[in-house]
Amino acid sequence: ELCDDDPPEIPHATFKAMAYKEGTMLNCECKRGFRRIKSGSLYMLCTGNSSHSSWDNQCQCTSSATRNTTKQVTPQPEEQKERKTTEMQSPMQPVDQASLPGHCREPPPWENEATERIYHFVVGQMVYYQCVQGYRALHRGPAESVCKMTHGKTRWTQPQLICTGEMETSQFPGEEKPQASPEGRPESETSCLVTTTDFQIQTEMAATMETSIFTTEYQ
């Protein structure tokens, strides 16, 4: 089931999903001067089953001026520099779908893709937040938001993260300022929580993210 809205915005922070739940849509958006081909898909879809998931449909962009550039190839390195990256600058790679059943990895770029990726997330999706470079996190460990279904409505939990403008090299400093207790996930809330497997795997993954630094992110 699709989440009704987008994940919360945190000032000076970016978010990413480590893997995308089945049913997630990624809009086929093109950079300026290009547009989706007339016979092209509106979006890519994470589809499959518990043992194997993959992105269905292919995004293709064509020049707005001359409508014949419909090939789909991976951008060259210089083309990739123009795009906002979804990869974190750390040795950690996106989770393989095999290690997280029912999920897809970050899809590869397509030629002349827009700089911003527009996802439509589904219930149970977890996204992780981190302060952008030059900002300091007033929180130890990963901050996350989960799309939950409660009383027939979807909502995202509030990420436990505040980013301040102090120039620090460490994203998660040893000393942190106290902050008000953010929204938690009460045990009694059972309608459409993330499955235990999802939560355990993703929490373990998140623990490895402490030292990693996001660059400019898709939001």
Epitope: L2, D5, D6, G23, M25, N27, R32, R35, K38, S39, G40, S41, L42, Y43, L45, T47, D56, N57, S64, E116, I118, H120
Partner: antibody, heavy 114, light 107 residues
């Protein structure tokens, strides 16, 4: 919560034009295409076209080229559709849609009559 | 243009029944099909995207299936509030097109 609020009903003369609006709330307006749909009794639903407010791109159904003009104002998060040279065939309910057709406005009824 | 045909304009059903609404495309659309429900005097409401995925808040008695050119919306355990008109739509290629609609009514 995502909402698409459309302007009120219009009674217009043949040969004139009409411009209706669709104000989006609850999501990032510049991220998603806004589509426009025509509905007439006995004629079902017809896709008119769509506009991407972020890049100001438009796509039109050939049938509505020259009839409909789609625009968007990112400052007010509002999409507009203007219909020109109106005839009785244009009498219909017009819907705007957002976020890949997941959300629909309440519709604007256009009645063309002399 | 890709023509979507909903061969049955009307379907009669009873509360508790299982009913299947069909939609046939003139050209292959993969799974790029959506289903909408429209009640009199209301806007269409999105039920299904990508042929088989439910939108949030849509009861699980609504299920979509199919790929290529043949698609089905199945309503199991029909409720009185399900009496409405159902439309399919393809968004695989421009211009996007809709089926003519199938009206579900009580026997």
């Amino acid at each position: 919560q995502v909402q698409l609020q459309q302007s009120g009903a219009e009674l217009v003369r043949p040969g004139t034009s009409v411009k209706m609006s669709c104000k989006a709330a609850g999501y990032t307006f510049t991220n998603y295409w806004i589509g426009w749909i025509k509905q007439r009794p006995g004629h079902g639903l017809e896709w008119i076209g769509d506009i991407h407010p972020g890049g100001d791109y438009t796509n039109y159904n050939e049938k509505f080229k020259g009839k409909a003009t789609l625009t968007a104002d990112t400052f007010s998060s509002t999409a507009y559709m203007q219909l020109s040279s109106l005839t009785s065939e244009d009498s219909a309910i017009y819907y705007c849609t957002g976020r890949n057709f997941a959300y629909w406005g309440q519709g604007t009824l256009v009645t063309v009559s002399s | 243009d890709n023509v979507l045909t909903q061969s049955q304009k009307f379907m009669s059903t009873s509360v508790g029944d299982r009913v299947s609404v069909t939609c046939k495309a003139s050209q292959n659309v993969g799974t790029n099909v959506a289903w909408y429900q429209q009640k009199p005097g209301q806007s269409p409401k999105a039920l299904i995207y990508s042929a088989s995925y439910r939108y949030s808040g849509v009861p699980d008695r609504f299920t979509g299936s199919g790929s290529g050119t043949d698609f089905t919306l199945t309503i199991s355990n029909v409720q009185s509030e399900d009496l409405a008109e159902y439309f399919c739509q393809q968004y695989n290629s421009y211009p996007y097109t809709f089926g003519g609609g199938t009206k579900l009514e009580m026997k």
